[in-house]
């Protein structure tokens, strides 16, 4: 039952984001998961770390992983998948899941390699009239059906407002997406829903679009959230849309 000899799936996430590491196994028997162990092998001669263990309906995150890891799978259905939240640089490495079935000596093992990139800018800058892409990706090794993507805006003056909504009703196989209110016809879904990517593009930016944009991606009862702050500056056709951290040099009137 060892999956470690095949090349493990890899996930690349930014600091502060979440990662869902799958550990699902197919069993012909009706035996249930008895114990689960998640460990982290950071590599480079560093000591292996214990992340979480589970037995007898007790799920215990260990050490620095307390409050950041949860078992997300349906344990009754042979799923011991792990959700790691607020990813830190030190979390990089190979995660190994070990599942044991009651009364069996065999251990089902699965590995996931996690790469951690620096934190993405949480603040974006755009000029009036421009267009801006706002990213919202939930990193997961498991192909899970996105049931809903929602973007909510809260500005300085306005109360919370729906920017965009996408639904997928599994039973009815109905899909629809819609932009709302003063965002109508200005927002498009640019991410690949089937890759848990709910990124949107906002065009024809207005000054009143400045504020907080909160994205939520729903995968069944699992919800991933991310907030972006959008700053809108007066119209300036010569500059490109960039994250606030990489703001361009604005030239004076007599400079080329």
């Amino acid at each position: 039952l060892n999956d470690l000899n095949v090349s493990p799936p890899e996930l690349t996430v930014h600091v502060g984001d979440s990662a869902l590491m799958g550990c699902v196994f197919q069993s012909t028997e009706d035996k249930c998961i008895f114990k689960i162990d998640w460990t982290l092998s950071p590599g480079e001669h560093a000591k292996d770390e214990y992340v979480l263990y589970y037995y007898s309906n007790l799920s215990v995150p260990i050490g620095r992983f307390q409050n950041r890891v949860h078992l997300m799978g349906d344990i009754l259905c042979n799923d011991g998948s792990l959700l790691l939240q607020d990813v830190q640089e030190a979390d990089q490495g190979t995660y190994i899941c070990e599942i044991r079935l009651k009364g069996e000596s065999q251990v089902f093992k699965k590995a996931v390699v996690l790469h951690v990139l620096p934190e993405e800018p949480k603040e974006l800058m755009v000029h009036v009239g421009g267009l801006i892409q706002m990213g919202c990706v939930f990193q997961s090794t498991e192909v899970k059906h996105v049931t809903k993507v929602e973007w909510i805006f809260s500005g300085r003056r306005a109360k919370e407002e729906i920017v965009f909504r996408y639904y997928h009703k599994l039973r009815m196989s109905v899909e629809y997406s819609q932009s709302w209110g003063h965002f109508q016809n200005r927002v498009n879904l640019v991410g690949d829903i089937f890759r848990n990517d709910g990124s949107i593009m906002l065009q024809g930016v207005r000054e009143s679009d400045g504020g907080n944009y909160t994205c939520s991606i729903h995968l069944g009862n699992l919800v991933f959230k991310k907030t972006i702050v959008l700053h809108v500056s007066p119209e300036e056709p010569r500059t490109l849309v960039t994250p606030a951290a990489l703001r361009p040099l604005v030239l004076g009137g007599n400079q080329l």
Epitope: K35, D37, Y53, S59, V60, I62
Partner: antibody, heavy 115, light 104 residues
């Protein structure tokens, strides 16, 4: 030196009693705390576990309703409250810590209170 | 259920002592041995059926698999006078053997 300091012997009226177990010289929230009862007739009997980090508990069915396990992270102290006390509950109770030895199959009691 | 035998035994200094523990089902090496001296708390001797705990004299050893396990004391010493318990940690409720009282 890692130690578990238990509350001393108590003379109580029938009713309830709360035993304490203070953890010294280790990170209280990183280890499971278990309680074990010892009698001449039944020997060592496992009562249950509390994980102070997660607050999770598991009880031996035999002691459900008899024992309640809690933990106070701020004082690194685990508690066991025993209810509906009778003379049969008069015996030695140990708190003991479980340490990790390679996988969750293999956790054993490496530190015990004095009882 | 763990069945420990014998319930008691006496041994001379230098003698080899063997205590056995039988589980009612396979416990996959999830077994520990403890020593308890009169009026004291139990002390861990062996874990994972055959791993010696730090600081425990090498005359103590554990062996076995499946449902049958044993503790061996090579060359009995006076300080080994105690009661010995086996414990399974494979599943909850965790259970102990009834104990073996070893006398000099």
């Amino acid at each position: 030196d890692v130690q578990l300091v238990e509350s001393g012997a108590e003379l109580v009226r029938p009713g309830a009693s709360k035993l304490s177990c203070k953890a010294l010289a280790y990170t209280f929230t990183d280890y499971e705390m278990h309680w074990v009862k010892q009698t001449p007739v039944h020997g060592l009997e496992w009562i249950g576990i509390i994980h102070p980090g997660s607050g999770g508990t598991v009880y031996n069915q035999k002691f459900k309703g008899k024992a309640t396990l809690t933990a106070d992270k701020s004082s690194s102290t685990a508690y066991m409250e025993l209810s509906s006390l009778t003379s049969e509950d008069s015996t030695v109770y140990y708190c003991t810590r479980r340490r990790y030895y390679g996988s969750s199959y293999n956790w054993y009691f490496d530190v015990w209170g004095a009882g | 259920v763990l069945t420990q035998s014998p319930a008691s035994l006496a041994a001379s200094v230098g003698e080899t002592v063997t205590i056995t523990c039988r589980a009612s089902e396979n416990i996959y090496y999830s077994l520990a041995w403890y020593q308890q001296k009169q009026g004291k708390s139990p002390q861990l001797l062996i874990y994972n059926a055959n791993s010696l705990e730090d600081g425990v004299p090498s005359r103590f050893s554990g062996s076995g698999s499946g449902t049958q396990y044993s503790l061996k004391i090579n060359s009995m010493q006076p300080e080994d006078t105690a009661t010995y318990f086996c414990e399974q940690t494979y599943d909850v409720p965790l259970t102990f053997g009834a104990g073996t009282k070893l006398e000099l």
